[in-house]
Amino acid sequence: RNLPVATPDPGMFPCLHHSQNLLRAVSNMLQKARQTLEFYPCTSEEIDHEDITKDKTSTVEACLPLELTKNESCLNSRETSFITNGSCLASRKTSFMMALCLSSIYEDLKMYQVEFKTMNAKLLMDPKRQIFLDQNMLAVIDELMQALNFNSETVPQKSSLEEPDFYKTKIKLCILLHAFRIRAVTIDRVMSYLNAS
């Protein structure tokens, strides 16, 4: 089921629009995968929710206090004029925790982007031509990363001279799409909170 299309306010916190697009795109891609890979465990009941960002980023830990901490007086002393080059935090003084949260979201997106691009390169070589990643989803990830635009070194796509294991790639695709959808929900909630505050 497609999520309703939101028409953002021109003055809206810019990343909210991108996060809504991301959630919609990953939900659509997941629906497509479930339909196409019907002989693979690809439904939320079947799948294991494995997180590739585990022990590498701390998005939930960093972003949860933003919602829980209504009174940010404890953070005010650590307030920093940390401003990213992108539009999400432009001309705002942000709390240390908010900066940490958005930085962690950026790192999550970067990790998933590398995985998805690598998998898509393999899927494009599949003689069965069964499934490919939605270019719109990859574009939306890129847009949100650009809007966040933390000065981070670009991670090269994992190139491989090995013959692709198409079966493994499809199993992994289902697992990562489910995990990424959960992360996209978290990102959207964070952006909604920041837009409202």
Partner: nanobody, 114 residues
Framework: EVQLVESGGGLVQPGGSLRLPCVAS????????MGWYRQTPGKQRELVAS???????SYADSVKGRFTISRDNAKNTVYLQMNSLKPEDTAVYYC????????WGQGTQVTVSS
């Protein structure tokens, strides 16, 4: 600390059967989709069967209908039942996770020959 230990391999005639167990440490096993892989000399490791923590399975086309993967969550063990073995199934068999692979075990050699 050894985290993945495969066993049960051996020499078997075409048409024969083998059952391979793999014991994994709890952190690798719990809540993760596990898979059996195989590798022949000069070729890369390929996934042949996978099983989710809830027991949902799937198989590579080359082994479908002949191999069965199962797991015992209480024993942190994943099994590969191999029936109607063919010479082309000769390989070293390994188990591991699917998404974030752990350090590989030693594997177990399966040779199908008359």
């Amino acid at each position: 600390e050894v985290q993945l230990v495969e066993s049960g391999g051996g020499l078997v005639q075409p048409g024969g059967s083998l059952r391979l167990p793999c014991v994994a440490s709890g952190s690798i096993f719990r809540g993760n989709t596990m898979g059996w892989y195989r590798q022949t000399p000069g070729k890369q490791r390929e996934l042949v069967a996978s099983i989710t923590s809830r027991g949902y399975t799937s198989y590579a086309d080359s082994v479908k209908g002949r191999f069965t993967i199962s797991r015992d969550n209480a024993k942190n063990t994943v099994y590969l039942q191999m029936n109607s073995l063919k010479p082309e199934d000769t390989a070293v068999y390994y188990c591991n996770r699917i998404v974030v692979e752990s350090q590989w075990g030693q594997g177990t050699q399966v040779t199908v020959s008359s």
